[in-house]
């Protein structure tokens, strides 16, 4: 539980930039939470570097991270989930740099899954649905979702729709006829907890029907 490195200590090590970032995932494995940290500089020599978290823990002073290639990882039930923890990069007993972080403000939800799109011919629309593991969780239950879709040929022209439910209706007339679309979704905490966007769900691809010449409407696929 040593503090910051003293001046003159570990002189070579202190020439490096040990900036790091972390994210937490709550109830990621049953009732277990996880905390993942990584250096912002991918070229940092991590050979002798360790991460340690102290404070805001249940009945322990500190926990050590496991090293998994270039990331550092903890899975535990021992987060109090209130107040700030002290997360330090260490060489042996010496701390090179530390950050005070409230784990409830760096939550990264799990990626949504089971994304699908169903065309409703009578309604002339597409119903987008997806699932999230957070519906079953005790803590991070309220999420904002970002649904992004694009015509496959338009590499960077994504249209984004924010929603709090797991169902979205896209009107057929807003989409190009006879076109292939890619759609994906991600999530971010939206109540009490704060943090980062999840990873994107796997993309789903769907084709819009052609326009029916006589009526000006799209043909079903």
């Amino acid at each position: 539980e040593s503090g910051y490195a003293q001046n003159g200590d570990l002189e070579d090590a202190e020439l490096d930039d040990y900036s790091f970032s972390c994210y937490s995932q709550l109830e990621v494995n049953g009732s277990q939470h996880s905390l993942t940290c990584a250096f912002e500089d991918p070229d940092v020599n991590i050979t002798n570097l360790e991460f340690e978290i102290c404070g805001a823990l249940v009945e322990v002073k500190c926990l050590n991270f496991r090293k998994l290639q270039e990331i550092y990882f903890i899975e535990t039930k021992k987060f109090l989930l209130i107040g700030k923890s002290n997360i330090c990069v260490k060489v042996g007993e010496k701390s090179l740099t530390c950050k005070k972080i409230d784990l409830t403000t760096i939550v990264k939800p799990e990626a949504p899954f089971d994304l699908s799109v169903v065309y409703r011919e009578g309604a002339n629309d597409f119903v987008v649905t997806f699932n999230t593991s957070h519906l079953q969780k005790k803590y991070v239950k309220v999420l904002m979702h970002d649904v992004a879709y694009r015509q496959e040929k338009d590499e960077n022209k994504w249209t984004h729709v924010n929603l709090s439910s797991t169902k979205l209706t896209l009107l057929q007339r807003k989409l190009q006829p006879a076109a292939m679309y890619e759609i994906k979704v991600r999530s971010i905490p939206d109540h009490y907890f704060k943090g980062f966007w999840s990873e994107w769900s796997p993309s789903y691809y769907f084709r819009t029907p052609e326009i029916n010449n006589s009526s000006g409407e799209m043909d079903p696929i």
Partner: antibody, heavy 119, light 105 residues
């Protein structure tokens, strides 16, 4: 203003249990830990445990684990400390204290509840 | 578990004198806090995170230290400063020192 108001003094027999309440006002109850600290007559301070009122997660001093139970009722912003199997050396003033989560010090204290254990 | 030893147990000084209270930890502590307690009253936060003065604490108080040795200093004692002062580690199990009583000589 921020305030913690504790229940009144108690006299208990050895082997009995005591439950002390701590009513919080003037702040968001679920935003800070509630800690319990005791002080035997003429002695120093001893941390017993804490509760996170948001989720009910508790952390106990190993010395008291199994004898102390911390609970809360968020609807009335009140925390409770129950100590069981009382002994004469549990005679003390029991304080609730709000935990500042940025620095982990106890920034607001209740007035204290005197618990006397005597046969 | 870390043990915090405060010295001296009692400090007998006159108003206007300088007071130096020590808190020694059995192993390294990142942050230390200090509380003031007067007879019949609850403790009051006095100095937190080594050197930050709690609300309403006069500037004649200061805190310093690192590792295992921490100090609370009162530059010039005022009558209201005579009390018991406790140090406390910031982390589980939030151990307190035994206290230093600052009394009027």
């Amino acid at each position: 203003q921020v305030q913690l108001v504790q229940s009144g003094a108690e006299v208990k027999k050895p082997g009995a249990s005591v439950k002390v309440s701590c009513k919080a006002s003037g702040y968001t109850f679920t935003g800070y830990t509630m800690n319990w600290v005791r002080q035997a007559p003429g002695q120093g301070l001893e941390w017993m445990g804490l509760i996170n009122p948001y989720n009910g997660v508790t952390s106990y001093n190993q010395k008291f684990k199994g004898r102390v139970t911390l609970t809360r009722d968020t609807s009335i912003s009140t925390a409770y400390m129950e100590l069981s199997r009382l002994r004469s050396d549990d005679t003390a003033v029991y304080y609730c204290a709000r935990g500042d989560g940025n620095y982990w010090y106890f920034d607001v204290w209740g007035q204290g509840t005197t618990v006397t254990v005597s046969s | 578990e870390i043990v915090l030893t405060q010295s001296p147990a009692t400090l007998s000084l006159s108003p206007g004198e300088r007071a130096t209270l020590s808190c020694s930890a059995s192993s390294s502590v990142t942050y230390m806090h200090w509380y003031q307690q007067k007879p019949g009253q609850a403790p009051r936060p006095w100095i937190y995170e080594i050197s930050k003065l709690a609300s309403g604490v006069p500037a004649r108080f200061s805190g310093s230290g690192s590792g295992t040795d921490y100090t609370l200093t009162i530059s010039s004692l005022e009558p209201e400063d005579f009390a018991v002062y406790y140090c406390q580690e910031w982390n589980y199990p939030y151990t307190f020192g035994g206290g230093t009583k600052v009394e009027i000589k």
